[in-house]
């Protein structure tokens, strides 16, 4: 009978410490949840002050079009503006057309003067092709105007309404571009 | 705080491809591109290929036709496709992840291509 009430007893602690395992993974998974809740609520936030303002572009940057251009009030060299723009969630501007050329150089022309602004253009050391950093070329009429004599690297650069180029490490404004943000409404 | 990381590197033979993969964790709502990276001249580090949010892509000059970039958002996952390698790929390739205010960076994985 002893034996009995000894293996009752044995169970009963086995389950309570089973409810306690329980209940701590809850508490867990609560606190877990909780934590999960106000990072979604923060996103959500930052989502809905977004949509409040319901600008397809961030603040400080041109909408044209599709896409949202940001210039520069720092030089960098050309692969550090890369990166700059990188951070922002944005690649150095990829001119795809004569249209879209004119509408930078005359938003260059408002915000700053005659002025040198990295773009996302270099050149290959082996076969001299110029490609935008995504591995496209350029169209015909966006080829930058020989000009840079480098042995390094060479990147295309935009001033007033021409596109050149230059040694990649020299210090000059950049431009970012990123997609303009679609209006759901 | 984001946790990053590298997986896919190994040895292949000059011509063959590897997958490299970069899994991100932690506080990812605030990651804005994530890149690719391996040695360069000088103690530097290069950019071989990066991805930002939206989509768009660079690469750097020698890797333009061979590697691309993918992302995959439900993974939280970036993908480096390298085709075609060369024994000039040989590298330790590692994975960065760009926020506004700061940039993190995986352990790295080892490329060899041999010839």
């Known amino acids: 009978k002893l034996l009995q009430v000894s293996t009752i007893a044995m169970q009963q602690q086995e389950k309570l410490i089973q409810q306690e395992r329980a209940l701590l993974n809850f508490t867990e998974w609560k606190r877990s949840c909780a934590l999960q809740m106000k990072y979604c609520q923060a996103f959500m936030q930052n989502s809905l002050s977004s949509a409040h303002n319901s600008s397809p572009c961030p603040n400080n940057w041109i909408q044209n079009r599709e896409s949202c251009y940001y210039v520069s009030e720092i030089w960098s060299i050309w692969h550090t503006s890369q990166e700059n723009c990188l951070k922002e969630g944005s690649t150095l501007l990829q001119i795809e057309s004569k249209e879209e050329m004119d509408f930078i150089t005359g938003s260059l022309r408002k915000i700053k003067g005659s002025y040198d602004y990295w773009v996302g253009l270099s050149q290959d050391g082996h076969s001299g092709r110029w490609l935008w950093q995504d591995g496209s070329s350029p169209s015909p009429g966006l080829l930058p105007a020989e000009r840079s004599q480098s042995a390094n690297q060479v990147c295309g650069y935009v001033k007033s309404n021409s596109l050149l180029s230059s040694n990649c490490s020299t210090w000059k404004y950049f431009i970012c571009e990123k997609y303009a943000l679609r209006s759901s409404v | 705080q984001v946790q990053l990381q590298e997986s896919g590197g190994g040895l292949v033979q000059a011509g063959g491809s590897l997958r490299l993969s970069c899994a991100a964790s932690?506080?990812?709502?605030?990651?804005?591109?994530m890149g690719w990276y391996r040695p360069a001249l000088g103690n530097q580090r290069e950019l071989v290929a990066a991805i930002t949010n939206d989509g768009r892509t660079t690469y750097v000059d020698s890797v333009k036709g061979r590697f691309t970039i993918s992302r995959d958002n439900a993974k939280n996952t970036v993908y480096l496709q390298m085709n075609s390698l060369k024994p000039e790929d040989t590298a330790v390739y590692w994975c960065?992840?760009?926020?506004?205010?700061?940039?993190?960076w995986g352990q790295g994985t080892q490329v060899t291509v041999s010839s």
């Open positions: 960065k992840a760009f926020t506004r205010d700061k940039d993190y």
């Open positions: 932690g506080s990812i709502l605030s990651i804005n591109s």
